[in-house]
């Protein structure tokens, strides 16, 4: 057992927040400022992530964990660990390479990110349009015309004419 212990890597005793310092006879030294080690037995500490520009600090770096970033208002995270910040658009718009673009007629987006998607086609489910769609909201489907009691009128307003293109706001 003693022999096994002596063969063991002395660096394995260094806890998170420290590194095994080869320059100091493999003793465990604390991570320098702005660096961290999240696991034990590390020979170096990793540099802390810096949340600059459009990134802002969500969680400060500590000796045992990296900083975490999110995005400044008007942007949202993209990619694991918020590796990028992407511009928000308004509801009723989608982000393109050329910036925010209004949803085309017949499509909507109820979020500040993502792509405008087509309105639900109520007739595919044998239903009628109860509330017309907008750029920000999907249509609301109601009962099929046959389901309406005799004499009851459908609340479906007439379908709007094709809108002209909107310029982005």
């Amino acid at each position: 057992f003693e022999r096994t212990r002596s063969l063991q890597d002395p660096c394995s005793n260094c806890p998170a927040g420290t590194f095994c310092d080869n320059n100091r006879n493999q003793i465990c030294s604390p991570c320098p400022p702005n660096s961290f080690s999240s696991a034990g037995g590390q020979r170096t500490c990793d540099i802390c992530r810096q949340c600059k520009g459009v990134f802002r600090t969500r969680k400060e770096c500590s000796s045992t964990s990296n900083a975490e970033c999110d995005c400044t208002p008007g942007f949202h995270c993209l990619g694991a660990g918020c590796s990028m910040c992407e511009q928000d658009c308004k509801q009723g718009q989608e982000l393109t390479k050329k910036g925010c673009k209004d949803c085309c007629f017949g499509t909507f987006n109820d979020q500040k990110r993502g792509i405008c998607r087509p309105w639900t086609n109520c007739s595919l489910d044998g239903k009628s349009v109860l509330v017309n769609g907008t750029k920000e909201r999907d249509v609301v489907c109601g009962p099929s015309p046959a389901d309406l009691s005799p004499g009851a009128s459908s609340v479906t307003p007439p379908a709007p004419a094709r809108e002209p293109g909107h310029s982005p706001q």
């Epitope: 993209l78 990619g79 694991a80 590796s83 990028m84 992407e86 982000l95 393109t96 390479k97 050329k98 910036g99 673009k101 085309c104 499509t107 979020q111 990110r113 993502g114 792509i115 405008c116 998607r117 087509p118 293109g165 982005p168």
Partner: antibody, heavy 119, light 111 residues
């Protein structure tokens, strides 16, 4: 380099379901790109099926929306497509592909997997 | 849905020829001076390969004999001097709105 490998194709009975997989290597599917599926019936053109973004928002072909489910498993770096109530006209080569950060065009494609729907 | 119509459906050409393929959209795929249209090349038994995006931008690694032009509803893919490896089927794709749609394809055959 980005590599996409589809699997799960084969012979399926009409009315059945199938789940296709697309294993990505050389790139993380949790990077922020959109990922999608496109199919091609024998001797025919390309048909766009679905997209999924980093947040898990899903976008489908209007005509196939009720029968398609796109999903992803970031831990396995794999994209999936489930297609239900299969018909003979679903016979096609199914491709997965990487799009850009806007879900527009497709810059990397898998080699495709053939699905044959027949009794 | 935006329909894309390619013409011709097929064409025969010789090595060295200048080849032009057109793609017409049922409505404009432009926004703020930008055209949301791509071109792909597909060879038999292979996956499509991106050639051109944003109507005229050449994808990295694609030979300069390929070029794209057009705006609004009318777009063109030009191969300035056809090479043996260019015999394939070419597709346009719009990404102005969902659902994304492809043209029906143009097959370029050896004369």
């Amino acid at each position: 380099e980005v590599q996409l490998v589809e699997s799960g194709g084969g012979l399926v009975q009409p009315g059945g379901s199938l789940r296709l997989s697309c294993a990505a290597s050389g790139y993380s599917i949790s990077s922020g790109h959109y990922w999608g599926w496109i199919r091609q019936a024998p001797g025919k053109g390309l048909e766009w099926l679905a997209l999924i973004d980093w947040y898990g928002d899903k976008y489908y072909s209007t005509s196939l929306k009720s029968r398609l489910t796109i999903s992803r498993d970031n831990s396995k770096n794999t994209l999936y497509l489930q297609l239900n109530s299969l018909r003979a006209e679903d016979t096609a080569v199914y491709y997965c592909a990487r799009s850009d950060y806007y879900g527009s065009h497709f810059d990397y494609w898998g080699q495709g997997t053939l699905v044959t729907v027949s009794s | 849905d935006i329909q894309l119509t390619q013409s011709p459906s097929s064409l025969s050409a010789s090595v060295g020829d200048r080849v032009t393929i057109t793609c017409r959209a049922s409505e404009s795929v432009d926004f703020d001076g930008f055209s949301f249209l791509a071109w792909y090349q597909q060879k038999p038994g292979k996956a499509p390969k991106l050639l051109i995006y944003d109507a005229s931008n050449l994808e990295t690694g694609v030979p300069s004999r390929f070029s794209g032009s057009g705006s609004g509803t009318d777009f063109t893919l030009t191969i300035s001097s056809l090479q043996p490896e260019d015999f394939a089927t070419y597709y346009c794709q719009q990404y102005d709105t969902l659902p994304r749609t492809f043209g029906q394809g143009t097959k370029v055959e050896i004369k």
